[in-house]
C-alpha cells in the first residue's frame, strides 16, 4: 500500500513558525503578514511504527524537496538533522527509524518524538530566529509543544 | 472498482452483542489498513478502530476499548468488528474504510468508504 502523507506547516506553543535557515537548517520564528509565505511546508507521511490512541508514527519531510528531518548521534549527543535522499525511494511506509518521529497529541497541542532516541523531542528555543533542535527535556526553558495547519496540495 | 459492503447491522439491547462485517473488492486487500468509522444520529464522523496490514497491530477508540474487537480475514478479503456490551451510545452508522489512517485525534484519512449498516442499541 501506498505511503498516505498530507501538507501541514507546523508552529511552536509560542506560534513561533519555522523556516529555512540555509540549506540543511530550520530555524523559528514569530512572522507575520505576507511573512508567513517564508514558513516550511511540510509533506507529513504517515508510517510504520509503534502507534496508540494518542502517539502516530510520521516521518517530516519538506515538500517537494528531497529533505526529510531526522535524528542522528552527533558527539555522542542525539541530533536533528535535515537528511537528503532519494526522491525515487522516498517516502515509504517502512522508513528507517531515523526519520520517525511518535507524533503525540495532548491537550490539542503536538509534540515529536524521536522514534531513534525516546524522550527526545523536536524543539525550540524561547529566543528568536534560534535554530529547531532535538531536546532532551520536557516542561523546562525549551518549547515541545506545537500546532498543525494543514495545508491544501 | 473498490467496493466495501458492510453487514450484520441491527436492533439490539444494551448489553448486547452484534458482529459486523466488510467484505472487500477491487484492490489487495492484504496490502491496507482498515478500519471502522461511525457516524451516530445528528453527529461527526468518529474514528472507532483500525487494523495494520497483516493484522498484526490494532487500535481503538477509548469509548470502545475492551468492548469491541476489529480482525480480518485476508483470505476472505473480510474485516469484521466485534461488538460486545453495547450502549445506547453506541447506535450509528458503522463503516467500513480502505487505507484508513488517522491524523489526529480527530481527522482521518481514508481512500473509500461502504454504505454502512446502521446498529441501534435500544431496550
Known amino acids: 500500500a501506498p505511503v498516505r502523507s498530507l501538507n501541514c506547516t507546523l508552529r511552536d506553543s509560542q506560534q513561533k513558525s519555522l523556516v529555512m535557515s540555509g540549506p540543511y537548517e530550520l530555524k523559528a520564528l514569530h512572522l507575520q503578514g505576507q511573512d508567513m509565505e517564508q514558513q516550511v511546508v511540510f509533506s507529513m507521511s504517515f508510517v510504520q511504527g509503534e502507534e496508540s490512541n494518542d502517539k502516530i508514527p510520521v516521518a517530516l519531510g519538506l515538500k517537494e524537496k528531497n529533505l526529510y528531518l531526522s535524528c542522528v548521534l552527533k558527539d555522542d549527543k542525539p541530533t536533528l538533522q535535515l537528511e537528503s535522499v532519494d526522491p525515487k525511494n522516498y517516502p515509504k511506509k517502512k522508513m528507517e527509524k531515523r526519520f520517525v518521529f511518535n507524533k503525540i497529541e495532548i491537550n490539542n497541542k503536538l509534540e515529536f518524538e524521536s522514534a531513534q532516541f525516546p524522550n527526545w523531542y523536536i524543539s525550540t528555543s524561547q529566543a528568536e530566529n534560534m535554530p529547531v533542535f532535538l531536546g532532551g527535556t520536557k516542561g523546562g526553558q525549551d518549547i515541545t509543544d506545537f500546532t498543525m495547519q494543514f495545508v491544501s496540495s | 472498482e473498490v467496493q466495501l459492503l458492510e453487514s450484520g447491522g441491527g436492533l439490539v439491547q444494551p448489553g448486547g452483542s452484534l458482529r459486523l462485517s466488510c467484505a472487500a473488492s477491487g484492490f489487495t486487500f492484504e496490502d491496507y489498513q482498515m478500519g471502522w468509522v461511525r457516524q451516530a444520529p445528528g453527529k461527526g464522523l468518529e474514528w472507532v478502530s483500525s487494523i495494520s496490514a497483516m493484522g498484526n497491530r490494532t487500535y481503538y477508540a477509548d469509548s470502545v476499548k475492551g468492548r469491541f474487537t476489529i480482525s480480518r480475514d485476508d483470505s476472505k478479503n473480510t474485516l469484521y468488528l466485534q461488538m460486545n456490551s453495547l450502549r445506547a451510545e453506541d447506535t450509528a452508522v458503522y463503516y467500513c474504510?480502505?487505507?484508513?489512517?488517522?491524523?489526529?485525534?480527530?481527522?482521518?484519512?481514508?481512500?473509500?468508504w461502504g454504505q454502512g449498516t446502521l446498529v441501534t442499541v435500544s431496550s
Open positions: 474504510a480502505e487505507n484508513l489512517v488517522r491524523v489526529t485525534a480527530r481527522k482521518w484519512m481514508f481512500d473509500y
